[in-house]
């Protein structure tokens, strides 16, 4: 994938990363439209959507990583998310089918924005990793537990099961991005210091 130009300003980059992760923890941009499009917007199914949200690294795991390790883990996890989103997108109804059934096209457009947004975040992760590599203080890289584990669905018995598995996955993704945002919020004012 082509990498966009990188800011050399640590604070600018960190601000962009924080803004992007804030957007990505917002369920109205991904999970909620998915729930509506798939007809899972009833109380019973919303309850089951919240269960066991996939093999995403926990906030505790993320906090235990050095900054480089954290960025590696985040990048690897987002790579898995991109694959899963591509799979989910293939199973979504087409725009003309949505129109026929009176559903909101905006919901489909929101879902289709998720992958470009993640690619933008990964670009900034790459930039931050470069910037940290050039900073004075070396930090040991700890590989994140479960960093490259794709959140695996249970074997689906039918299309309905896959919809619910998609819902659980997206719920887990939003929770993960919330944890990521909390970790970024503890990063210090310079590439050499972390607030604890």
């Amino acid at each position: 994938a082509a990498i966009g130009s990188c800011s050399k300003e640590y604070r600018v980059l960190l601000g962009q990363l924080q803004k992007q992760t804030d957007l990505m923890q917002d369920t109205s941009r991904l999970l909620d439209p998915y729930i509506r499009i798939q007809g899972l917007d009833v109380p019973k199914l919303r309850e089951h959507c919240r269960e066991r949200p996939g093999a995403f690294p926990s906030e505790e795991t993320l906090r235990g990583l050095g900054r480089r390790g954290f960025l590696q883990t985040l990048n690897a996890t987002l790579g898995c998310v991109l694959h899963r989103l591509a799979d989910l997108e293939q199973r979504l109804p087409k725009a003309q089918d949505l129109e026929r059934s009176g559903l909101n096209i905006e919901d489909l457009e929101k879902l289709q924005m998720a992958r470009p947004n993640i690619l933008g975040l990964r670009n900034n992760i790459y930039c931050m990793a470069q910037l940290l590599d050039n900073s004075d203080t070396a930090e040991p890289t700890k590989a994140g537990r479960g960093a490259s584990q794709p959140p695996t669905p249970t074997p689906a018995s039918d299309a309905f099961q896959r919809k619910l598995e998609g819902c659980r996955f997206l719920h887990g993704y939003h929770r993960f991005m919330h944890s990521v945002g909390r970790v970024f919020s503890k990063w210090g004012e310079s590439p050499n210091r972390s607030r604890r």
């Epitope: 019973k44 199914l45 309850e47 089951h48 099961q161």
Partner: antibody, heavy 117, light 113 residues
């Protein structure tokens, strides 16, 4: 093929606890789905009591919330119902059932429980 | 809780007849998203557990004869048996599959004339 089988005492004294077991074969209760208890009173009224999900989370009928507990033993592929402080009103046939989220597709044969002194 | 009301409470029929039974819910069982209704129909014969016939208000469960048809939307639902067979004599229950607590109708008993 998926099968569910209820077991437990057929007679319970008032104020005591009712404990039932549902043994599942042909499907792991940790793979997916919600595993439910439903009872049918004399006169045929059906009442959903609660579930334990594949992940271990539970949900109960508010009408029973203070008295009910559903647990499981994943090593034996069993889930359990405990209903405390029973009265004669709890006399019913108790069923366990699998909910695949669209409906309850597999049911046990049911076990009859009488509450009487 | 969603209250499910079934009518009639019993039906006397002859073999080969078409029968319809009604189920009304106190709240809509419709998903606003894809317009799917979350209602199930079960058949229960004496001494047996309920058996799933219809889910999603109109989708027949695998193995259920096509003489059974579910229809309706929102709060009003119908189960139709196009040509009643002797083995269809049973009690039929509708169930709210939209919200917890799950709730059942009181049933419609199908009897022979």
């Amino acid at each position: 093929e998926v099968q569910l089988q209820e077991s437990g005492p057929g007679l319970v004294k008032p104020s005591q606890s009712l404990s039932l077991t549902c043994t599942v074969t042909g499907y792991s209760i940790t793979s997916d789905y919600a595993w439910n208890w439903i009872r049918q009173f004399p006169g045929n009224k059906l009442e959903w009591m609660g579930y334990i999900s594949y992940s271990g989370s539970t949900s109960y009928n508010p009408s029973l919330k203070s008295r009910i507990s559903i647990t499981r033993d994943t090593s034996k592929n069993q889930f359990f119902l405990q209903l405390n402080s029973v009265t004669t009103e709890d006399t019913a046939t108790y069923y366990c059932a699998r909910d695949r989220y669209e409906a309850m597709d597999y049911w046990g044969q049911g076990t009859s429980v009488t509450v009487s002194s | 809780d969603i209250v499910m009301t079934q009518t009639p409470s019993s039906l006397s029929v002859s073999a080969g007849e078409k029968v319809t039974m009604s189920c009304k819910s106190s709240q809509s069982l419709l998903s606003s998203g894809n317009q799917k209704n979350y209602l199930a129909w079960y058949q229960q014969k004496p001494g047996q557990p309920p058996k799933l016939l219809i889910f999603g208000a109109s989708t027949r469960e695998s193995g259920v004869p096509d003489r059974f048809t579910g229809s309706g939307s929102g709060t009003d639902f119908t189960l139709t048996i196009s040509s009643v067979q002797a083995e269809d004599l049973a009690v039929y229950y509708c169930q709210n599959d939209h919200s917890y607590p799950l709730t059942f109708g009181a049933g419609t008993k199908l009897e022979l004339k």
